[in-house]
Each structure stands twice: as C-alpha cells, then as structure tokens.
Amino acid sequence: FERTRSLQDPCSNCPAGTFCDNNRNQICSPCPPNSFSSAGGQRTCDICRQCKGVFRTRKECSSTSNAECDCTPGFHCLGAGCSMCEQDCKQGQELTKKGCKDCCFGTFNDQKRGICRPWTNCSLDGKSVLVNGTKERDVVCGPSPADLSPGASSVTPPAPAREPGHSPQ
C-alpha cells in the first residue's frame, strides 16, 4: 500500500522538516526559517510558536518541531503545552480577578497557586485539633482526649488536600 501511495502521491516522500512545494513541481523543499513540519508528506510548514511577553522559550523551534514555552518567574503554566501563564501569589493567598487576596479565616493555601481550601474538620473523625491552622497551613489533628491511653502519642496527619479546582492543567 505504501509503495502504491508513493507512486500516486510524490508528496508522501517528503520527510519531516520539508514540505511538498506545488510551485516547484512537487519537490520537497526545506521549511523556511521560523517554520516547521513534524511529519512527512506535508504540503505546508507550520509557523513556529513565539514565546514572548510572560512566555519564555523552553525549547527552540527546529525544522521538525515547534518551539516550547514556559512562564517567566512569578507565573506558572496553564493548559495544554503551556498555552497560558497565570501569576503566582504568596502562600496564604489565592488569585482572584482583584489580584492576590489573603485566604479567609478557616481556609488555607500552602502553594503559590490554586485556591484557599477549608481547614480539615478534625471532629468529623472524632479527633481534636493538635495544631491550629493558619492561612498557609492546615490544622493538625490529634487523638481525642478520650482516646489517649498511657504511652499513646500518635499524631494523625491531615487528610490529603483536594486538588484545587482553580486552575485547569
């Protein structure tokens, strides 16, 4: 099938990094500067992505692969292939349309991104608060006083934090 296809379509012989140039009798021509083709048999080359503004170049464009961007310090990537950059906040804050805002009492964020999440409710597990929560840290739950027996001093770590629903990644 491949041999038949090659006979019918000379463009199928053009490798990645080239395009099938209709203006030159379907000769395989190299991709022009700032363009690429990642597969063979292409009739055009794609324009390279430019990483500008908040985006910085993680990988340069080549004739066979697109440039890859990441975000400048103080920002983080969002979306497939780092299609967006979102600004960081401090721990204990969340990003809103009014900028970075402190977590409300009873919530925390231990990262520079994402949303403030409620402190763990220790009493739901029949435990007591061993260490109070802050804007930056969840509470630490400990055994309830009734559970304390001589020699027992185990501390239960807080439940794993939920994934922030703030930033689709």
């Epitope: 969002l78 967006m84 950059c85 979102e86 990003l95 809103t96 689709p168």
Partner: nanobody, 123 residues
Framework: EVQLVESGGGLVQPGGSLRLSCGAS????????MLWFRQAPGKGLEWVAN????????YYVDSVKGRFTISRDNAKNSLYLQMNTLRAEDTAIYYC????????????????WGQGTTVTVSS
C-alpha cells in the same frame, strides 16, 4: 495573526500624566478580558489592572488605585491605561495582555502579550 501592540510610553516628570494604548488584531477583541502588567527595572512582572469584556468590571493593584484608569473601546479594538499623578516608582515597561478563554471563571491565565512600551518617570 493574533497580535497586541502597545504605544504611548515616554519620559514624563513626577506628577505628570500619560495615556497608554494597546491595539488588538487577529481575534474578537470584545470577547476577552484584557489586562495591563508592568516590569520595573530589575524587578518581576506585576499585574496592574484588568477589565472585563464590556468594561463594566475594572480592578487595580493597590499601588495605582485612584491614579490609573483602565478602559477599552471595542469598536476600535483598543485597550487604554490612563496614568495620572505619576511617580518615580511607576517607571517600568508596560505590557497589555489577553485573558485566556475562561478567564475569571476557571482561571486567571493570559495567553497573548504585546511587546511592551517603556514609561520613565523622572525629573
């Protein structure tokens, strides 16, 4: 091609005013939140202000509140930043940026940036 081009920067004395413009092309300008950021010499990028699609919501960083005004003209595909009572600490490169699809609902990411325009406040 999706593009943002800033203009209007320059040298101004403390207490003076400048109006920055940002022309948009290659996309439906009226469908997107728009933002201004700035980068002072030797510092990181700082969010300055943002505005929603129809201009009814505007937000500012505390340091420019009452001095800067963000606005837009969807008919002209243009974003503006009116800067009054300028201070030396406002010296920076100013960038306009487009809020990505879903901005303010699911994220606060930006996806298109201009090349920047330089504002210098000095006597």
């Amino acid at each position: 091609e999706v593009q943002l081009v800033e203009s209007g920067g320059g040298l101004v004395q403390p207490g003076g005013s400048l109006r920055l413009s940002c022309g948009a092309s290659g996309f439906t300008f009226s469908s997107y939140w728009m933002l201004w950021f700035r980068q002072a010499p030797g510092k990181g990028l700082e969010w300055v202000a943002n505005i929603n699609q129809d201009g009814s919501e505007k937000y500012y960083v505390d340091s420019v509140k009452g001095r800067f005004t963000i606005s837009r003209d969807n008919a002209k595909n243009s974003l503006y930043l009116q800067m009054n009572t300028l201070r030396a600490e406002d010296t920076a490169i100013y960038y306009c940026a487009r809020g990505g699809d879903g901005y303010s609902n699911s994220h606060f990411g930006t996806d298109v940036w201009g090349q920047g325009t330089t504002v210098t406040v000095s006597s």
